[in-house]
């Protein structure tokens, strides 16, 4: 799928499904116990396909990974096959690092919440990955949306600066994950 | 690749203890959990409980509490199954597992024959 | 504890024939379900997770369906490799808990 940024604009272009990020230095300023406290200020390439690179055309590159912000509504599960047939995978955050870069880039679209790749079955066991690695509540905590009405959210997403537990039916955006060796 | 590696085969009189060891490679050791499960000659499979390799946290099937013990060294990618006051009826391999996607068990180490008899 | 059913307990076939192999749950544990293969003397090992996720190195001729309840392991053409006994298990609450197995044999 082809999604085009148009250098010529600046705002975030959206075509085909796909946000494309020019992860600008100006947008949201870190407010306290937000996400983005004491995070770096990151540069991130988007690939052309034009140049020789490790990620798909018009995939974010960030360290070893390449990122696609899909823009298309869908469960969670409905989110991860998604990626899957894109060879990837929801994301994954394994550094501060990475997760200022993330939320730099999500942080550009303040009215939506995009699913990464942390799920469990019931709210008696613990959070896992997609590739069915542990969690660290070290890297960042998740805000928790239950109520006695929807006491059950085993999915999680990224909205802003805030990483929440959500129902897994609900539509939402995503982010795929492509991890690539240098 | 990924290989878990058990201990050899142990003979055990009823009312001892066993250890039993489990050395991880080509992951990192502290990423995933490792599961224990049991499969008695003629069996079926048993899930035991694991142990987070990070923290150190286990999770014991409430059949085993209070005579198992999972631990770790995370110095040799090494996990250990401790379980005491056997009994005969705790003859069985001993298998450790490397947990994958969906809390499922991708990766399976050789298992380790625990013969109980006096 | 959530209980897990299996059947047929054994089965008897043919290499190329199709094989359905059922698994129910006690209660509903959504797609919280994978099958393995073991064959004697060996361990278990992994084909099918999130009750319809093909595990990587799988040969696509197994598939997984279902959710809630009731799943179905299918082994559309059987080879002669695949003669073994598969378990169902359950990871949506602890203890996580496996079905009794279902003996594939040849005929």
């Known amino acids: 799928t082809m999604a085009i940024w148009r250098s010529n604009s600046g705002s975030n272009t959206l075509e085909n499904g796909y946000f494309l990020s020019r992860n600008k230095e100006n947008h949201s300023q870190p407010t306290q116990s937000s996400l983005e406290d004491s995070v770096t200020p990151t540069k991130a390439v988007k690939t052309t396909g034009v140049l020789s690179s490790p990620c798909p055309p018009n995939w974010i590159i960030y360290e070893k990974s390449c990122y696609l912000f899909s823009m298309s509504l869908n469960s969670w599960d409905g989110s991860k096959r998604q990626c899957w047939q894109l060879g990837s995978n929801l994301l994954k955050i394994d550094s501060s690092n990475e997760l200022g870069f993330i939320v730099k880039q999500v942080s550009s679209q303040p009215d939506n919440s995009f699913w990464i790749g942390l799920s469990r079955p019931q709210t008696e066991v613990p959070w896992l990955w997609e590739d069915g690695s542990t969690f660290s509540s070290n890297l960042f905590q998740i805000r928790t949306t239950a109520t006695q009405e929807n006491p059950s959210p085993n999915c999680v997403w990224i909205h802003v600066s805030v990483i929440y537990d959500q129902l897994c039916s609900v539509p939402s955006y995503s982010i795929c994950e492509k991890k690539f060796s240098m | 690749q990924v290989q878990l590696v058990q201990s050899g085969a142990e003979v055990k009189k009823p009312g001892a203890s066993v250890k039993v060891s489990c050395k991880s490679s080509g992951y990192t050791f502290t990423d995933y959990y490792i599961h224990w499960v049991r499969q008695a000659p003629g069996q079926g499979l048993e899930w035991m409980g694991w142990i987070n390799p990070n923290s150190g946290d286990t999770n014991y099937a409430q059949k085993f509490q209070g005579r198992i013990t999972m631990t770790r060294d995370t110095s040799i990618s090494t996990a250990y199954l401790e379980l005491s006051r056997l009994r005969s009826d705790d003859t069985a391999v001993f298998y450790c597992a490397r947990n994958s996607a969906s809390y499922s068990f991708g990766y399976w180490g050789q298992g380790t024959l625990v013969t109980v008899s006096s | 504890d959530i209980q897990m059913t299996q059947s047929p307990s054994s089965v008897s076939a043919s290499v190329g024939d199709r094989v359905t192999i059922t698994c129910r749950a006690s209660q509903g544990i959504s797609s919280w379900l994978a099958w393995y293969q073991q064959k004697p003397g060996k361990a278990p090992k992994l084909l099918i997770f999130?009750?319809?996720s093909l595990q990587s190195g799988v040969p696509s001729r197994f598939s997984g369906s279902g959710s809630g309840t009731d799943f179905t392991l299918t082994v559309s053409s059987l080879q002669p490799e695949d003669f073994a006994t598969y378990y169902c298990q359950q990871a949506y609450s602890f203890p996580f808990t496996f079905g009794p197995g279902t003996k594939v044999d040849i005929e």
């Open positions: 999130g009750a319809s």
